[in-house]
Amino acid sequence: AHTAAPQVTSTASKLLPPVAFNHTIGHIVLSEHKNVKFNCSINIPNTYQETAGISWWKDGKELLGAHHSITQFYPDEEGVSIIALFSIASVQRSDNGSYFCKMKVNNREIVSDPIYVEVQG
């Protein structure tokens, strides 16, 4: 995907594998008043020490407050898989737009591929 991926840690010159959000559904088309759910997921190896939470953005603005998002963590011996779920109940035309996930890993911002929600009247 077309995302900035960190190459080195700030504390050591040890090379790290690139990290990027996994591919997801791109263009969602649905009728007004339907419910919609989509997600971003990312696998963070143990070699990455500093990670921040996933934030959701729409058309360049961070979505804060009354938006229904849940983040789930699935750790294993190699690292952690993170899935950020976003849902909109009874979509309206104003929900049209480009949704992105953002996350900071080792002080580098990673941005997901877009999820474009198109609400038809």
């Epitope: 995907a1 077309h2 591919h23 997801t24 263009h27 088309v29 058309d59 591929d113 198109e118």
Partner: antibody
Framework: QSLEESGGRLVTPGTPLTLTCTVS????????LGWVRQAPGKGLEYIGI??????TYYATWAKGRFTISKTSSTTVDLKITGPTTEDTATYFC??????????????????WGPGTLVTISL | DIVMTQTPASVEAAVGGTVTIKCQAS??????LAWYQQKPGQPPKVLIY???HLASGVPSRFKGSGSGTQFTLTISDLECADAATYYC?????????????FGGGTEVVVR
Amino acid sequence: QSLEESGGRLVTPGTPLTLTCTVSGIDLSSYALGWVRQAPGKGLEYIGIISSTGTTYYATWAKGRFTISKTSSTTVDLKITGPTTEDTATYFCARGAYAGYVAFGPYYFHIWGPGTLVTISL
Amino acid sequence: DIVMTQTPASVEAAVGGTVTIKCQASQSISNFLAWYQQKPGQPPKVLIYAASHLASGVPSRFKGSGSGTQFTLTISDLECADAATYYCQSYFYSSTSIYNAFGGGTEVVVR
């Protein structure tokens, strides 16, 4: 909603040429507008786009050869800076499907103009 | 740049038959893919977007499918009016750029 291209004509190689896309019933502060060309008997070739915010993006091959600019609330220009005979084509402008004040979006094309023919010849 | 490879370049089928056109992207574009129909002397007309959604007024004989890098346009119950050239288009984008490209086109001849 409609679009119409103008300015297509016969010019000699190296003579700059400006094409204009005039829109009717389309808010250029909400929609992106793209340019696509088609050489005689050939396929569609994407040139570039100007977003609702005024951000321009060009196909790699088109960078430096074309300039897209919003010249009024109803017109967008495509300047061919140094045309060669390979630039002979019908040039189409088209409205992006995505309404939103953002620089980048899913720009497939819902509405097209009829095209204007540009001929570059000695 | 993303490169869209369309096959075949030309296909012929009888009225009432079915044609299948394939489009391959050089990298994953999710479902950010549109299909257009163009008849001689006319601008293209969008048929399908989001890989599989029919544009307004397009008959259900046109069907799009696929995701990632492999996409298909199927036209069933062919009519004479379907004789045209068909193009796929990637409209993938990111938070910093766009990746628009057309396929080379497929001429559909209806006999």
